[in-house]
Interface confidence: medium
């Protein structure tokens, strides 16, 4: 089946906007907007630090680490209030992602 221009293949995502704010010392705030064409039972999420279609149950229960949102070699840690997750790099640097 051929895709029309601008049409996404089922189960895929693309980044449509990205913004970085490095005005605060030792802290960079990055916002990313993605467009996804998810299959039934899936919802837009993050896998290996990229937008991806993930099992909708993960989102419903806020089991964010089950999406495998961190890069290979990083450790995923759920924020206690379930508002997001942290990815800890081998060197100890922590990246926090919150879901809004």
């Amino acid at each position: 089946q051929f895709l029309k221009e601008g049409q996404l293949a089922a189960g895929t995502c693309e980044v449509i906007a990205a913004h970085r704010d490095s005005s605060q010392p030792r802290r960079t705030i990055a916002r990313q907007t993605a467009r996804c064409a998810c299959r039934k039972g899936q919802i837009a999420g993050t896998t290996r630090a990229r937008p991806a279609c993930v099992d909708a149950r993960i989102i419903k229960t806020k089991q964010w680490c089950d999406m495998l949102p961190c890069l290979e070699g990083e450790g995923c840690d759920l924020l206690i209030n379930r508002s997001g997750w942290t990815c800890t790099q081998p060197g100890g640097r922590i990246k926090t992602t919150t879901v809004s």
Partner: antibody, heavy 122, light 110 residues
């Protein structure tokens, strides 16, 4: 086998502070969130608080919020509960608990310590 | 919080069901914890709705229907006599997600 060994309990004075330590073994400690649950004499289980894997994030039950601090040392495989401004109602057995997955809730505890008894009395 | 019956009783070999309802986080499931005496540590018999630790006999199972969770002991034995607590999570704007437990159900094996 997973073991959680609590220590630091005993007789405490009202208004004082206590520090409980849980030493873990038998699993990769840094891969699991940990928590504390307590039980007053003859009563049910009460949530004290939890800490995430890295130690950067904590949450506390309403009865101890503002008085409790949970910390962890992944190198030593220990988790510590500090409780200040002790009250008689803090009397009970304090259990260390391990989460079964990437987080700990009252539904996902898969291992418990033997407990350490705390008595707050003048 | 969580509601569970205060006591249940059964003869050896019978099937026992203990229910637990309420809680603010049914998506996160329920856990069941056995305590044989007030001075002993709890033992996890079911976590995350239906997962059973490897050292727990297969006669223990968990199931969920709506907001009610049920612990089933198929072919109850004398050593199963204990207090069973269910656990779940509740949410408050003050404390966020906080664990909650039922008051406990005393199982007597006749």
């Amino acid at each position: 086998a997973v073991t959680l060994d609590e220590s630091g309990g005993g007789l405490q004075t009202p208004g004082g502070a206590l520090s409980l330590v849980c030493k873990a073994s038998g699993f990769t400690f840094s891969s699991y969130q940990m928590g504390w649950v307590r039980q007053a004499p003859g009563k049910g289980l009460e949530w004290v608080g939890v800490i995430n894997k890295s130690g950067s994030d904590t949450s506390y039950g309403s009865a101890v919020k503002g008085r409790a601090t949970i910390s962890r040392d992944n190198g030593q495989s220990t988790v510590r509960l500090q409780l200040n401004n002790l009250r008689a109602e803090d009397t009970g057995t304090y259990f260390c608990a391990k989460g079964s997955a990437s987080y700990i809730t009252a539904a996902t505890i898969d291992a418990w310590g033997h407990g350490t008894e705390v008595i707050v009395s003048s | 919080a969580l509601t569970q019956p205060s006591s249940v009783s059964a003869n050896p070999g019978e099937t026992v069901k203990i229910t637990c309802s309420g809680g603010g986080s049914s998506g996160y499931g329920y856990g069941w914890y056995q305590q044989k005496s007030p001075s002993s540590a709890p033992l996890t018999v079911i976590y995350w709705n239906d997962k059973r630790p490897s050292d727990i006999p297969s006669r223990f199972s968990g199931s969920k229907s709506g907001s009610t969770h049920t612990l089933t002991i198929t072919g109850v034995q004398a050593e199963d006599e204990a207090v069973y607590f269910c656990g779940n999570d509740d949410y408050s704007s003050d404390s966020g997600y906080v664990g909650v437990f039922g008051a406990g159900t005393t199982l007597t094996v006749l």
